[in-house]
């Protein structure tokens, strides 16, 4: 039993290393930025400068493409709930430095929680997304 679990853990690690979670990060960032835009922001906010290049394409077409690619990646973790949790935590950890303020962080977390469901996958049980940047050790 323990041996199987160790093998399972190694398999999860290699799955995570192979996975490209970037489309998930891009999809989620676009989603929360669109939400912010639709609620309206300070027109003089520097992030509203139309000439500043954004790492995230805000147009809807790009987002649906990112979502499709994201779901394809997450699908690899469908049969391993713990590995799915690790993938989501990795997304959270990767983006935590880029999130501005508590509100954006909460919004990102909310969207991240819904991500498996959006992809038609089961959300992981016992999965704590309250991670800090650089806060977790790997097993």
């Amino acid at each position: 039993r323990q041996q199987w679990e160790l093998q399972g853990d190694r398999r999860c690690q290699s799955q995570l290393e192979r996975a490209n979670l970037r489309p998930c990060e891009q999809h989620l960032m676009q989603k929360i930025q669109r939400d912010e835009d639709s609620y309206g922001r300070d027109p003089y906010s520097p992030s509203q400068d139309p000439y500043s290049p954004s790492p995230y394409d805000r147009r809807g077409a790009g987002s649906s493409q990112h979502q499709e690619r994201c779901c394809n990646e997450l699908n690899e973790f469908e049969n391993n709930q713990r590995c799915m949790c690790e993938a989501l935590q990795q997304i959270m950890e990767n983006q935590s430095d880029r999130l501005q303020g508590r509100q954006q962080e909460q919004q990102f977390k909310r969207e991240l929680r819904n991500l498996p469901q959006q992809c038609g996958l089961r959300a992981p049980q016992r999965c704590d997304l309250e991670v800090e940047s650089g806060g977790r050790d790997r097993y």
Epitope: Q2, A123, C127, R136, Y139
Partner: antibody, heavy 123, light 110 residues
Framework: EVQLVESGGGLVQPGGSLRLSCAAS????????MTWIRQAPGKGLEWVAN????????DYLDSVRGRFTISRDNAKSSLYLQMNSLRAEDTAVYYC????????????????WGQGTLVTVSS | QSVLTQPPSVSAAPGQKVTISCSGT????????VSWYQQLPGTAPKLLIY???KRPSGIPDRFSGSKSGTSATLGITGLQTGDEADYYC???????????FGGGTKLTVL
């Protein structure tokens, strides 16, 4: 008011069997995970087993797997622990607990506990 | 030997603040939610904190929980003699597919 009442404890010889029961009331039993937790005299808490709302998933402490069986009867709002091949180290107070674990992004936590029933394994 | 490590005992004077640590690994605290329990002498344990930081109704805000990496902490402010008890942390361990409890910490209010 949530109530959990254990019964079935007692003195049993090594190798013997016992069946613990827990009668639940004051909440919708069928919507909660349930858990058995034990505490040996003068020692700390030790989780024994979990059972999902519909009984479809069960988890056990390694040292009791294959000897203990957790089950539930939602129609009777009752939780059970069948204990076979009992050993001296199984001597403990056994608590029936309600587990607040939900379907996603939540943890196991035990928000209601019974008074406990003492199981003594001795020759 | 518990996989979750707690100090065996802590003590402080009434009115003071005390913290109880619970140290684990990536497969338990690092990935899963932590809960805390108080066990007064001769009674069943009582839930104090769940999902790392949440308090059930009826638990005073003198009790707080936090988590960072693979460690969790229970904080108690405004210590009262009635707080003398054993305190346990708990979490799920993904490697073992089991709930783990810490070894317990005896709090003495001097």
């Amino acid at each position: 008011e949530v109530q959990l009442v254990e019964s079935g404890g007692g003195l049993v010889q090594p190798g013997g069997s016992l069946r613990l029961s827990c009668a639940a009331s004051g909440f919708k039993f069928s919507t909660f995970y349930m858990t058995w937790i034990r505490q040996a005299p003068g020692k700390g808490l030790e989780w024994v087993a979990n059972i999902k709302q519909d009984g479809s998933e069960k988890d056990y402490l390694d040292s009791v797997r294959g000897r203990f069986t957790i089950s539930r009867d939602n129609a009777k709002s009752s939780l059970y622990l069948q204990m076979n091949s009992l050993r001296a180290e199984d001597t403990a107070v056994y608590y029936c607990t309600r587990n607040g674990l939900q379907d996603s992004y939540s943890g196991d936590f035990f928000d209601h506990w019974g008074q406990g029933t003492l199981v003594t394994v001795s020759s | 030997q518990s996989v979750l490590t707690q100090p065996p005992s802590v003590s402080a004077a009434p009115g003071q603040k005390v913290t109880i640590s619970c140290s684990g690994t990536g497969s338990n605290i690092g990935h899963n939610y932590v809960s805390w329990y108080q066990q007064l002498p001769g009674t069943a344990p009582k839930l104090l904190i769940y999902d790392n930081t949440k308090r059930p109704s009826g638990i005073p805000d003198r009790f707080s929980g936090s988590k960072s990496g693979t460690s969790a902490t229970l904080g108690i402010t405004g210590l009262q003699t009635g707080d003398e008890a054993d305190y346990y942390c708990a979490t799920w361990d993904a490697d073992l597919s089991a709930v783990l409890f810490g070894g317990g910490t005896k709090l003495t209010v001097l």
